[in-house]
Amino acid sequence: PRSIEVKYIGVKSAYVSYDAEKRTIYLNITNTLNITNNNYYSVEVENITAQVQFSKTVIGKARLNNITNIGPLDMKQIDYTVPTVIAEEMSYMYDFCTLLSIKVHNIVLMMQVTVTTAYFGHSEQISQERYQYVDCGRNTTYQLAQSEYLNVLQPQQ
C-alpha cells in the first residue's frame, strides 16, 4: 500500500461568544484538513478526532465518525469544528478577549488532530499538531493557512 497523506491546512473560521456572568469564552473553531489517497484503491475515512489546547490545558474536543470515502489517487478537503470553552482557572482570558482597547485579540492554540483511515479491513492512524493564532475578540474567517502567520500581542521587553 502507498501512503495516505494528511495535511492540516489551518483554521477556517472562529466564532466567539461570551458569558459575562461566568467570565467564560466560547469559541467554535472550524479547521480544514486535506487527506490524499495515493493508493490505487478507495480508502474509508473512519473518524477524525481533534482536540484544542490553550496554555497546556485541553479546552475542546471533537470526534467525527463515518466521514467519507476517498477514491483512488484522489484528495478530499474536510472541515471539522471543535467547540472550545475558556473558563474557570483561565477566566482571566475573558478580560483580554473582551478588551476594546486592543484591535486584535490573538491567542495561541495548539491544534491536534488524528485521522483514522481503513482499507481492506486494515486501520491506520495519522496525527498532526500545529500551533495556530485565533482571534478570541470577534468572529473571524481566515484565508486558508493565514492563522499561522498572524502576530500575537506581546508586551515590550
Epitope: V16, Y18, Y92, F96, L99, S101, I102, K103, Q156
Partner: antibody, heavy 122, light 112 residues
Framework: EVQLQQSGAELMRPGASVKLSCTAS????????MYWVKQRPEQGLEWIGR????????EYAPKFQGKATMTADTSSNTAYLQLSSLTSEDTAVYYC???????????????WGQGTSVTVSS | DVLMTQIPLSLPVSLGDQASISCRSS???????????LEWYLKKPGQSPKLLID???NRFSGVPDRFSGSGSGTDFTLKISRVEAEDLGVYYC?????????FGGGTKLEIK
C-alpha cells in the same frame, strides 16, 4: 514598567493652538487604541476621542470635532492631542489613557498619563 | 450620544457607612459582542482617574472587595459597603460600548 508620560503644563493665549504629547513605555501604542479625556476646573470628566495609532484613524465626541486633533507617531511611541483656536473653555487638565496587556498571562492594566494642565489666559 | 445620568450629585457619608451611587444610561449600552461596558472610576484631586469596576460588576485588579457593581439594561449601581477615608473623591460612571464614549456627571463622596 508600563506607563504613559505626558508633556508639561502650558500657558496659552486665546486664539492660539497647543499640542500635547503622551509617550508610552512598556508597550507599543500601535497595538492599542489611545484615548483622551478632559477635565475642566471643578467640572466632570469628558471623553474627547480615541485614535488608532497604527493607521491614524480617529473618532471624536461631537463636542470636540474641529477643536481637537489626535495624531500618533508609532516610531516614538507617542500620541498627540492638538487643540486649536483656544478659549477660556479649553482651560483644563487633559489625560491620555488606554488599557494594556502587561504580562505574558494576558492580564490587563488601566493606564493613565499624569495629566497636562492647559491654561488659556490673556 | 449616550447620556449617562448619575444620582446623587453629592453623597455625604460617615466613615463605615454603606454608600450607593446610581447611574442611568439614555439607551442600552450592550456592545455588539454582547458585553456591557459600564465602568466606574474614582477621581481624586491632583490624581488621574482610577478604574474600580468594568463590565458592570467586574472588580478591577487591586480594588478592595468593599466595592461592588450591579445593574443591567440602563440602570446601574456602585456600592461601597464600608466607606473608608481613602474612598473619598468623585465617582464617575462611564460607558465604553458605543462611540462616542461618555462619562456620567460625577458623584462627590464626602464626609457628613
Amino acid at each position: 514598567e508600563v506607563q504613559l508620560q505626558q508633556s508639561g503644563a502650558e500657558l496659552m493665549r486665546p486664539g492660539a493652538s497647543v499640542k500635547l504629547s503622551c509617550t508610552a513605555s512598556g508597550f507599543n501604542i500601535q497595538d492599542y487604541y489611545m484615548y483622551w479625556v478632559k477635565q475642566r476646573p471643578e467640572q466632570g470628566l469628558e471623553w474627547i476621542g480615541r485614535i488608532d495609532p497604527e493607521d491614524g484613524d480617529a473618532e471624536y465626541a461631537p463636542k470636540f470635532q474641529g477643536k481637537a486633533t489626535m495624531t500618533a507617531d508609532t516610531s516614538s511611541n507617542t500620541a498627540y492631542l492638538q487643540l486649536s483656536s483656544l478659549t477660556s473653555e479649553d482651560t483644563a487638565v487633559y489625560y491620555c489613557s488606554t488599557r494594556v496587556i502587561y504580562d505574558g498571562y494576558y492580564r490587563t492594566m488601566d493606564c493613565w498619563g499624569q495629566g497636562t494642565s492647559v491654561t488659556v489666559s490673556s | 450620544d449616550v447620556l449617562m445620568t448619575q444620582i446623587p450629585l453629592s453623597l455625604p457619608v460617615s466613615l463605615g457607612d454603606q454608600a450607593s451611587i446610581s447611574c442611568r444610561s439614555s439607551q442600552t449600552i450592550v456592545h455588539s459582542n454582547g458585553n456591557t461596558y459600564l465602568e466606574w472610576y474614582l477621581k481624586k484631586p491632583g490624581q488621574s482617574p482610577k478604574l474600580l469596576i468594568d463590565k458592570i460588576s467586574n472588580r478591577f485588579s487591586g480594588v478592595p472587595d468593599r466595592f461592588s457593581g450591579s445593574g443591567s439594561g440602563t440602570d446601574f449601581t456602585l456600592k461601597i459597603s464600608r466607606v473608608e477615608a481613602e474612598d473619598l473623591g468623585v465617582y464617575y460612571c462611564f460607558q465604553g460600548s458605543h462611540v462616542p464614549y461618555t462619562f456620567g456627571g460625577g458623584t462627590k463622596l464626602e464626609i457628613k
